[in-house]
C-alpha cells in the first residue's frame, strides 16, 4: 500500500456514503514521507469494511427505512494517518465536484459538445475516520463542501467545537467524560501521585490536558507528563520507560491517555527492560479491551485498568462475517490480502498473491479461529444507521408522500442533511438510544476493564465496573484480591501526630517531608506549627494549647528537687 495506487471498495446505490477505515496500520516513521501504509488490520480495518457493506445490505432490505432508495458506499483506507486520509478525502471531494458540475451542465467535451459520460455519484456524507487527529484534518476539508461527517471512535474534546467543526458528529462521547472517569478511578484508590503519558496527536493531547486539569482540582499530583507517537521507534519507548522508572517507587500508577499502539509500544519496552509488574497502567479507551494491544506481552499488561466505551458485541455481524471466504468475497478488495496475512499463507491465483508466505492456504481455514469482534463495532454500525435515518427524515420532510428520491433531494443539500442528522434519534444496535446534543456528541457510558491473569499463562480482560454520566461503580474485590494488595502511588506518606508537612522548594504539593513541632508548639494546620502563648502548653494530641495551672508554693511545701546537668 503506497501512495501511488489506492484501492477503493464500491457498492452501487442511489445515494453514496463515503467511509474512511484504517484498513492498514499507519506508515512507520521511515515510510511516512512516501505514505506507505503498514500491515493490514482485522478489527479496525477489514471488520469495519465488512460492517459497512453488510449494514447497507440490511438497510436496503428494510422496507421501513428509505423505501425505494438504495444506499451505496465508497470505502477508502485512512491508514490511521492524516496525510493518507486527506489524500483519500480529496478523492471524495473530487467526485462530488465533478458530479455537481455535471448536474449543472458544466461538463463539456474538448470539442465543445456535451458529455454523455456519467461520472460517479457524489458522496453525501462520510463515516469515520477512527483517529481524532485524522478526523480533524478530514473535517477541515469536508466542511468546506458541506459534507456531514459521522465518527464512530474519534472522541477528542476539540471536535465538540461547532464553530470549528460544523459538519462533524459522532455516535461516541467526548473525551472530557472519560478523563473524568479516569480521575474518579485515581481518586477512588487514593493515588495522589501518578505519572502521565499520552499519544502525540489530538486524541492524546486534549484527553491528557483534561485529565491533568481535573486531577489538579482533586489534589492529584502528576509526577511528570510525557508524550510519544504510536509509531515511535524502540529507543524512544525505551527512553520513556526509563524516565517513568525514575519516578519509582513513588509514582507506580501511569495514567495513559493513549492509542492502543502506544500502549503496546510501552509494553514491548517493559519486556526489553525487564520491568513487568513495576507499574499499573491506567489506560483510556484507545486500549479498552483490545487483544492486539496485549498479545505476546500479557505479563507486562497484567493489572492494567482500562476505560472502554460501552458497546456489546453485535451478534448478527458475526453471523455474517464468520462465513466470509476469499474465493467468494470479491466486493472487498482488501480481503485476499487480509486472508493471507491472517493465516500466514499464500492464496494461489489471486491478484494479491503474496510470495512472502511459503505455505498455500488450506481450504479448511475459517475466520471462526481466534475470532474477536472489533470492540467498536456497535459504534461503526450506529454511525451508518445515523446517516440512513438522517437521510430518511430528510426524505420524509422534502418528499412527503413520495417513495424514493424526489427532485427536492437532487442533489442532496449537505446543509439540510446536517440539520436532519442533528435531530435524528433512534434505537441503536445494542438497544440504547442514539441521539446527538447541540455539539453533535453522544452521551457517555463506559465500562471499566481489568487485565488479569486468570490461570497459568491465561490472561483476559474482565469487567470490574462502570462509569455512567458521572457515577463510578467499581467491584474492588475483583480488582484487588486483598485490601493490602491495593497499589500505593503516593509521593509522601501522611505525617505522624505532632508533625507538619514541609514542601521542598520546586516540589509538587503531594511531596513533603514531615517535621515535628518544637516542644512548646502545636499543629496549627498541616503546614504550620505555632508556639503556645506564655503560660500555656501544647495538649497531648498537639492540636492546641492548655493553660498551665498556676501552683503557689506555701511555707510548709517540700523544697523543689533540682537536677544538675551532669546528673544521669
Amino acid at each position: 500500500q503506497s501512495s501511488e495506487r489506492r484501492v477503493v471498495a464500491h457498492m452501487p446505490g442511489d445515494i453514496i456514503i463515503g467511509a474512511l477505515f484504517s484498513v492498514h496500520h499507519q506508515p512507520t516513521v521511515d515510510k511516512v514521507h512516501e505514505r506507505k501504509c503498514g500491515a493490514v488490520r482485522e478489527q479496525y480495518g477489514i471488520q469495519r469494511v465488512e460492517a459497512m457493506l453488510h449494514t447497507l445490505e440490511r438497510i436496503n432490505s428494510d422496507p421501513t427505512l428509505l423505501p425505494n432508495i438504495t444506499l451505496g458506499c465508497e470505502i477508502r483506507d485512512s491508514c490511521w494517518h492524516s496525510a493518507v486520509a486527506l489524500e483519500q478525502s480529496i478523492e471524495f471531494i473530487r467526485d462530488s465536484l465533478i458530479s455537481s458540475e455535471e448536474e449543472e451542465g458544466l461538463v463539456r467535451c474538448v470539442d465543445g459538445s456535451s458529455s454523455s459520460f456519467r461520472s460517479k455519484k457524489p458522496i453525501v456524507g462520510v463515516i469515520g475516520p477512527g483517529s481524532s487527529s485524522v478526523a480533524i484534518q478530514v473535517q477541515n476539508l469536508l466542511q468546506l463542501f458541506n459534507i456531514p461527517q459521522i465518527a464512530y471512535s474519534a472522541t477528542s474534546m476539540d471536535l465538540s467545537d461547532k464553530t470549528l467543526f460544523k459538519y462533524f458528529m459522532r455516535v461516541v462521547p467526548s473525551d472530557a467524560q472519560q478523563a473524568r472517569a479516569m480521575v474518579d478511578i485515581v481518586k477512588r484508590y487514593n493515588w495522589t501521585y501518578v505519572s502521565a503519558v499520552h499519544t502525540e496527536g489530538n486524541y492524546g493531547e486534549s484527553g491528557m490536558e483534561a485529565f491533568k486539569d481535573m486531577s489538579a482540582k482533586e489534589g492529584i499530583c502528576i509526577a511528570h507528563s510525557y508524550k510519544i507517537y504510536s509509531n515511535a521507534g524502540e529507543q524512544s519507548f525505551d527512553k520513556l520507560l526509563k524516565k517513568l522508572t525514575s519516578h519509582l517507587p513513588k509514582a507506580r500508577v501511569v495514567a495513559c491517555f493513549c492509542e492502543g499502539m502506544t500502549v503496546r509500544g510501552l509494553l514491548m519496552a517493559m519486556r526489553r527492560l525487564g520491568l513487568a509488574g513495576e507499574f499499573l497502567l491506567l489506560g483510556s479507551d484507545g486500549w479498552a479491551d483490545r487483544y492486539d494491544v496485549t498479545d505476546g506481552y500479557q505479563r507486562e499488561a497484567v493489572g492494567g485498568i482500562t476505560i472502554k466505551l460501552q458497546s456489546p458485541d453485535v451478534k448478527w455481524f458475526d453471523d455474517y462475517y464468520l462465513k466470509l471466504r476469499p474465493e467468494t468475497n470479491h466486493r472487498n478488495p482488501w480481503f485476499q490480502e487480509f486472508w493471507q496475512h491472517r493465516f500466514q499463507c499464500r492464496l494461489e491465483g489471486f491478484p494479491q498473491e503474496n510470495s512472502k508466505y511459503n505455505k498455500t492456504c488450506d481450504s479448511s481455514l475459517t475466520l471462526k479461529t481466534h475470532h474477536v469482534q472489533d470492540s467498536k463495532m456497535g459504534f461503526v454500525i450506529n454511525a451508518i444507521y445515523s446517516m440512513a435515518y438522517g437521510l430518511h427524515n430528510m426524505q420524509m420532510s422534502l418528499c412527503p408522500g413520495y417513495a424514493g428520491l424526489c427532485d427536492a433531494m437532487k442533489p442532496i443539500d449537505g446543509r439540510k442533511l446536517l440539520e436532519s442528522l442533528m435531530k435524528t434519534n433512534f434505537t441503536g444496535v445494542s438497544g440504547d438510544m442514539i441521539l446527538f446534543d447541540e455539539n453533535g456528541d453522544s452521551p457517555g457510558r463506559y465500562e471499566i476493564m481489568n487485565f488479569k491473569e486468570m490461570g497459568k499463562d491465561y490472561f483476559d480482560y474482565i469487567n470490574v465496573g462502570s462509569w455512567d454520566n458521572g457515577e463510578l461503580k467499581m467491584d474492588d474485590d475483583e480488582v484487588w484480591s486483598k485490601k493490602s494488595n491495593i497499589i500505593r502511588s503516593v509521593c509522601s506518606e501522611p505525617c505522624e501526630k505532632g508533625q507538619i508537612k514541609v514542601i521542598r522548594k520546586g516540589e509538587v504539593s503531594c511531596c513533603w517531608t514531615c517535621t515535628p513541632c518544637k516542644e512548646n508548639e502545636y499543629v496549627f494546620d498541616e503546614y504550620t506549627c505555632k508556639a503556645c502563648q506564655l503560660g500555656s502548653w501544647p495538649t497531648d494530641d498537639l492540636t492546641g494549647c492548655d493553660l498551665i495551672p498556676v501552683q503557689y508554693l506555701r511555707w510548709g511545701d517540700p523544697e523543689p528537687d533540682y537536677k544538675d546537668d551532669d546528673d544521669k
Epitope: P249, G274, E278
Partner: antibody, heavy 121, light 106 residues
Framework: QEQLVESGGGLVQPEGSLTLTCTAS?????????MCWVRQAPGKGLEWIAC???????TWYANWAKGRFTISKTSSTTVTLQMTSLTAADTAAYRC??????????????WGQGTLVTVSS | ALVMTQTPSSVSAAVGGTVTINCQAS??????LAWYQQKPGQRPKLLIY???DLASGVSSRVKGSGSGTEFTLTISDLECADAATYYC????????FGGGTEVVVK
C-alpha cells in the same frame, strides 16, 4: 554501609539440590532495585542466572536456568536461589548482585563476595 | 537470546600504553552495555554503564564507546593496577556477559 552476603554453598552430590541465601544489609529493598544471582565457574567468566523485583516478586531467568533454578524473596532483606538437578557444570562461585536501576536488565552496581558450590560425587 | 562476544581473550601492553577491548552483541542493544573489572579473588567492579557513562569513582583514563552491536573499552596511560580481567555485559531483552578479556600490564 551497603553490603550483600551469600551463604549456603558447599559440596553437593550430582542430581542433588541446594538453596543459597543472599542477605542484604544497609540496603532498603523498598527503593525498588532488583536482586539477582550471577555465577562464575572456576577460571571462567560471569554468567547471569536470574533476577527478582522486590516490589512485585516477578522473576526473570536466563533461558538455561528456567525450570532448575528458582529465585525468591524470603524477607525484606533476603533473597534465595533454589537449585535442583545439579551437575558438575553447575560448580561455580555464586554471587548475589543488586541492579543499578529498577528493572531486571541493568548493570550490577553492588556485588557479594560469593559462595562456592561444588557438585561432585 | 542475547549473546555477547568479547575480543581478544587476552591482551598485554606496557605501563603508560593503551589497550582496546571489543564487545559484539548478537542483536541491536542500542547503548545498553556495561563494562566491569575483576581482579583475582575479588568481586566485579562496575566501570562503565550505558556504553559510555563512567561509574562513580572510576578513573577518566577508562573510556567506553559504541552503540548498536559494536562496543569498545579503551584504557589509556596503563598502570600496574589495571591488570585484571574485563567483562562486557549487554542488558537489553536479557542479561548476558562477554567471555572476558585478561589485561596484562608489563
Amino acid at each position: 554501609q551497603e553490603q550483600l552476603v551469600e551463604s549456603g554453598g558447599g559440596l553437593v552430590q550430582p542430581e542433588g539440590s541446594l538453596t543459597l541465601t543472599c542477605t542484604a544489609s544497609g540496603i532498603d529493598f523498598s527503593s525498588g532495585y532488583f536482586m539477582c544471582w550471577v555465577r562464575q565457574a572456576p577460571g571462567k567468566g560471569l554468567e547471569w542466572i536470574a533476577c527478582i523485583s522486590p516490589y512485585s516478586d516477578n522473576t526473570w531467568y536466563a533461558n538455561w536456568a528456567k525450570g532448575r533454578f528458582t529465585i525468591s524473596k524470603t524477607s525484606s532483606t533476603t533473597v534465595t536461589l533454589q537449585m535442583t538437578s545439579l551437575t558438575a557444570a553447575d560448580t561455580a562461585a555464586y554471587r548475589c548482585a543488586r541492579t543499578m536501576a529498577i528493572g531486571a536488565y541493568n548493570p550490577f552496581k553492588l556485588w557479594g563476595q560469593g559462595t562456592l558450590v561444588t557438585v561432585s560425587s | 537470546a542475547l549473546v555477547m562476544t568479547q575480543t581478544p581473550s587476552s591482551v598485554s601492553a606496557a605501563v603508560g600504553g593503551t589497550v582496546t577491548i571489543n564487545c559484539q552483541a548478537s542483536q541491536n542493544i542500542y547503548s545498553n552495555l556495561a563494562w566491569y573489572q575483576q581482579k583475582p579473588g575479588q568481586r566485579p567492579k562496575l566501570l562503565i554503564y550505558d556504553a559510555s557513562d563512567l561509574a562513580s569513582g572510576v578513573s577518566s583514563r577508562v573510556k567506553g564507546s559504541g552503540s548498536g552491536t559494536e562496543f569498545t573499552l579503551t584504557i589509556s596511560d596503563l598502570e600496574c593496577a589495571d591488570a585484571a580481567t574485563y567483562y562486557c555485559q549487554g542488558y537489553y531483552s536479557g542479561n548476558a556477559f562477554g567471555g572476558g578479556t585478561e589485561v596484562v600490564v608489563k
